[in-house]
């Protein structure tokens, strides 16, 4: 027989020879990092037809690293489901917990012993420091010093000293999230008051009021023969300005032809749609009609148009 077969997990005992006699036996031993579990044979014999009798290294098992328990509130996941050297152990924490230590450990061979590359990590509960205090407002659980994962606080504004209330700008509720960070920035409390929105040649159709605070919403339509330049709906934003800006009602210009169109009702378009006539050349109207005196509307002299401090 020629040289005996070679294996990944076991090696020949002694030096190989160029050829072997029929009936001659060779013995193997498990390589470093492998150990023998009976009863499979680890030897072979040169048989009559000059071939080696079947033998395998199935009796040699790879050294395994020590078993790693799941960390409390987490999981140890062996890559490929094995603890054998050459493989990794991954660690993950349950929701609401974070990892302290190595996320991956490696099963390494030191001499003939398989050991992990480090100490297994631990899973610690996600905790948040108290959320920020805000000017002119407060939050629930203000006496609590440590917040756990998903604990929530709700902000509210203090009563205002003047005639106009504080408005809460932003989300009122925030929660302790991953990485021990609050889910969003704290809101703010401030007086938000928008000027009375006046649209010449138009009228307000909803959102009537004497004062317009944060998030007040107003809708308009134009008088007959005028079209809306801008949005028909505006909202009082946190900067005490209307968003989008207060629209204008512009006169519908007759087409270039001699015959003007018959208009039987007012034309109201959205901010993205303009009347075809709006692009016509010619001077813009300069006539200013008197301020409308619709029921429920305050007159300008009532002070609503005064600038805000």
């Amino acid at each position: 027989c020629e040289e005996p077969p070679t294996f990944e997990a076991m090696e020949l005992i002694g030096k190989p020879k160029p050829y072997y006699e029929i009936g001659e036996r060779v013995d193997y031993k498990c390589k470093k990092g492998y150990f023998y579990i009976p009863p499979l044979a680890t030897h072979t014999i040169c048989d009559r037809n000059h071939t080696w009798l079947p033998v395998s290294d199935d009796a040699c098992y790879r050294e395994t690293c020590p078993y790693i328990r799941d960390p409390l509130n987490g999981q140890a996941v062996p890559a490929n489901g094995t603890y054998e050297f050459g493989y990794q152990m991954h660690f993950i924490c349950n929701e609401g917990y974070y990892l302290i230590g190595e996320e991956i450990l490696y099963c390494e061979l030191k001499g003939s012993v398989a050991i992990w590359s480090g100490k297994p990590p631990i899973c610690e509960k996600v905790l948040c420091t108290p959320p920020p205090k805000i000017k002119n407002g407060k939050h629930t659980f203000s006496e609590v010093e440590v917040f756990e994962y998903l604990d929530a606080v709700t902000y509210s504004c203090d009563p205002a000293p003047g005639p106009d209330p504080f408005s809460l700008i932003g989300e009122s509720t925030i929660y302790c999230g991953d990485n021990s960070v609050w889910s969003r920035a704290a809101p703010e409390c401030k007086v938000v008051k928008c000027r009375f929105p006046v649209v010449e040649n138009g009228k307000q159709i909803s959102g009537f009021g004497k004062k317009f605070y944060y998030k007040a919403t107003v809708m308009f339509e134009c008088d007959k023969g005028f079209y809306l330049d801008g949005s028909d709906t505006i909202v009082c934003d946190s900067n005490s300005t209307w968003d989008p800006p207060v629209p204008k009602c512009l006169k519908v210009l007759p087409p270039s032809s001699t015959k003007p169109p018959a208009l039987s009702h007012s034309v109201s378009t959205s901010s993205t749609t303009k009347s075809p006539a709006s692009s016509a050349s010619g001077p813009r109207p300069t006539y200013k009609p008197p301020v409308s005196n619709y029921p429920g509307y305050p007159k300008p002299e009532e002070g609503i148009l005064d600038s805000l401090d």
Partner: antibody, heavy 120, light 110 residues
Framework: EIQLQQTGPELVKPGASVKISCKAS????????MLWVKQSHGKSLEWIGN????????TYNLKFKGKATLTVDKSSSTAYMQLNSLTSEDSAVYYC?????????????WGQGTTLTVSS | VMTQSPLSLPVNIGDQASISCKST???????????LDWYLQKPGQSPQLLIY???NRFSGVPDRFSGSGSGTDFTLKISRVEAEDLGVYYC?????????FGSGTKLEIK
């Protein structure tokens, strides 16, 4: 009081399968792991495998891989071990035991055992 | 492999008893714990935990039971044997896969 209640004795024919149950009470089922052990008549104890009820993840003794399948039903706090292709070699008492999770965990409470007899 | 000795331990009530357990591999884990426990199986009963992590007595276990050792060599001692202590004692390692029990030591009356 922590208790692990196992099914009563089983008599099954060779080649058949059997499913042994272990109902846990008195503690949070998903906060522990469950270990299964075989004890053949008059012999020592053999570890079959563990299951983590929180994840359903299992670790087996290679000797029992393919023979035993470990599962859990979290809603009823019950662990199961199915043994298939039964032979007389599988006749034994089978125990479940609760293991504390985390580093430094150990197996503190055991079921009363289920006697399995495989005979035609 | 866990090698327990002796296989049988005849004692008189009140005597001290000592059981040895040797492992082929160190049972010290990289997490800092040594995973060696002792169980007693009384006749017709399930195994019951006596000692965990080498030397910690489980709740309700009398202080006459003590465990010691490190690495690969461990010992269970019973300072004064009582009748209720009779049964088979097993050491158990859960540091390496597969987890293994010792062959057992039968504590019996002389």
């Amino acid at each position: 009081e922590i208790q692990l209640q196992q099914t009563g004795p089983e008599l099954v024919k060779p080649g058949a399968s059997v499913k042994i149950s272990c109902k846990a009470s008195g503690y949070s089922f998903t906060d522990s792991i469950m270990l299964w052990v075989k004890q053949s008549h008059g012999k020592s104890l053999e570890w079959i495998g563990n299951i983590n009820p929180y994840y359903g993840s299992t670790t087996y003794n290679l000797k029992f891989k393919g023979k035993a399948t470990l599962t859990v039903d979290k809603s009823s706090s019950t662990a199961y071990m199915q043994l298939n292709s039964l032979t007389s070699e599988d006749s034994a008492v089978y125990y479940c035991a609760r293991g504390l999770r985390g580093y430094g965990g150990y197996f503190d409470y055991w079921g009363q055992g289920t006697t399995l007899t495989v005979s035609s | 492999v866990m090698t327990q000795s002796p296989l049988s331990l005849p004692v008189n009530i009140g005597d001290q008893a000592s059981i040895s357990c040797k492992s082929t591999k160190s049972l010290l884990n990289s997490d800092g714990f040594t995973y060696l426990d002792w169980y007693l199986q009384k006749p017709g009963q399930s195994p019951q935990l006596l000692i965990y992590l080498v030397s910690n007595r489980f709740s309700g276990v009398p202080d006459r039971f003590s465990g010691s050792g490190s690495g690969t060599d461990f010992t269970l001692k019973i300072s004064r044997v009582e009748a209720e202590d009779l049964g088979v004692y097993y050491c158990f390692q859960s540091n390496s896969l597969p987890f293994t029990f010792g062959s057992g030591t039968k504590l019996e009356i002389k």
